[in-house]
Interface confidence: low
């Protein structure tokens, strides 16, 4: 995670567009970096992150990383550029509107990661593919 005082480099000031040529705006993601979590043995969890940030670059997506070891469980929420690996893994699901957790091999811990590209999508992390679509939509508000 890039600490708050380190400025990310910006390659250029070109306007970013999607595949259809529409201007792509920076999206909103939960951005609490690493915090302790009580999320365990559940089909889905809320991040309990109260900071929503406007991602710095239009191409960035939302990422959540769930880690469990012998001592604790943590949940990391950030913005990240899907062209770059995160925790040494490629963000394969960056285009998904929902954050569907996938297990990754990490020695000494249980490690799940997901990425997604709708506003605040890393607020609701889903461990079961059978996502309950009857859940009410999250209120998409800035910084809330």
């Amino acid at each position: 995670t890039i600490p708050p005082h380190v400025q990310k480099s910006v390659n250029n000031d070109m306007i970013v567009t999607d595949n259809n040529g529409a201007v792509k705006f920076p999206q909103l993601c939960k951005f609490c970096d690493v915090r302790f979590s009580t999320c365990d043995n559940q089909k889905s969890c809320m991040s309990n992150c109260s900071i929503t940030s406007i991602c710095e670059k239009p191409q960035e997506v939302c990422v959540a990383v769930w880690r469990k070891n012998d001592e604790n469980i943590t949940l990391e929420t950030v913005c990240h550029d899907p062209k770059l690996p995160y925790h040494d893994f490629i963000l394969e699901d960056a285009a998904s509107p929902k954050c569907i957790m996938k297990e990754k091999k990490k020695p000494g811990e249980t490690f799940f990661m997901c990425s997604c590209s709708s506003d605040e999508c890393n607020d609701n992390i889903i461990f079961s593919e059978e996502y309950n679509t009857s859940n009410p939509d999250l209120l998409l508000v800035i910084f809330q």
Epitope: I2, P3, P4, K8, V10, D13, F25, P26, L28, F31, D33, R35, S50, I51, T52, S53, I54, C55, E56, P58, V78, C79, I142, F143, Q144
Partner: antibody
């Protein structure tokens, strides 16, 4: 050298309107979220409003929602605060500041020198 | 909203003194706490972010500590230019909120 220079403050009657401006230089304005923070005479600091780097998203503190509107012109490196239906309790020095919401940079730095808004009949 | 309470509201000190200002949050804010210095008629200036990280260009006599609900700003040896008002600010949740300020005056 980073500079934020506010203007547009002044004396206005209750119910009136003002538009504040903040001219920015010395950093890549279009890459950063910006905020307005105010300070009533002799009082502490209160965050008022924020806007995303691209200008497509804004957020206000509850007490000004529906009355104040933050905007920006990235081609002019300028931040604005349109203040309508002004009340006596809106009397304050208004500061513009870089920050709040870009990639977890949830602090304000740097700040402009401020512009005084006085609401009085 | 999270309430931030600073103490004391004012203090008198001499050049060379060690000064400590405390800030308490109404709920746990982890380490999401910033400190600012403001001189009369001037804009606030960021001193410390994330509870203990010194902002670039700020003298090392300033330090911050704490996590959860209780935080401290310490000036190890007060200098003439340090007489000012100091504010804490939480960035754990929106809206960001400030303490009421602590005025450091010359004894």
């Amino acid at each position: 050298q980073v500079q934020l220079v506010e203007s547009g403050g002044g004396l206005v009657q209750p119910g009136g309107s003002l538009r504040l401006s903040c001219a920015v230089s010395g950093f890549n304005f279009r890459r950063y979220a910006m905020s307005w923070v105010r300070q009533a005479p002799g009082k502490g600091l209160e965050w008022v409003s924020a806007i995303s780097a691209s200008g497509d998203r804004t957020h206000n503190t509850d007490s000004v929602t529906g009355r104040f509107s933050i905007s920006r012109d990235n081609s002019k490196n300028t931040l604005y605060l349109q203040m309508n239906s002004l009340r006596a309790e809106d009397t304050a020095v208004y500061f513009c500041a870089k920050g709040l919401a870009a990639s977890g940079k949830n602090y304000f730095d740097p700040w402009g020198q401020g512009t005084l808004v006085t609401v009085s009949s | 909203d999270i309430q931030m309470t600073q103490s004391p509201s004012s203090l008198s000190a001499s050049v060379g003194d060690r000064v400590t200002i405390t800030c308490r949050a109404s709920q746990s804010i982890s380490s999401y706490l910033n400190w600012y210095q403001q001189k009369p008629g001037k804009a606030p200036k960021l001193l410390i972010y994330a509870a203990s990280s010194l902002q670039s260009g700020v003298p090392s006599r300033f330090s911050g500590s704490g996590s959860g609900t209780d935080f401290t700003l310490t000036i190890s040896s007060l200098q003439p230019e340090d007489f000012a008002t100091y504010y804490c600010q939480q960035s754990y949740s929106t809206p960001p909120t400030f303490g009421q300020g602590t005025k450091v005056e010359i004894k």
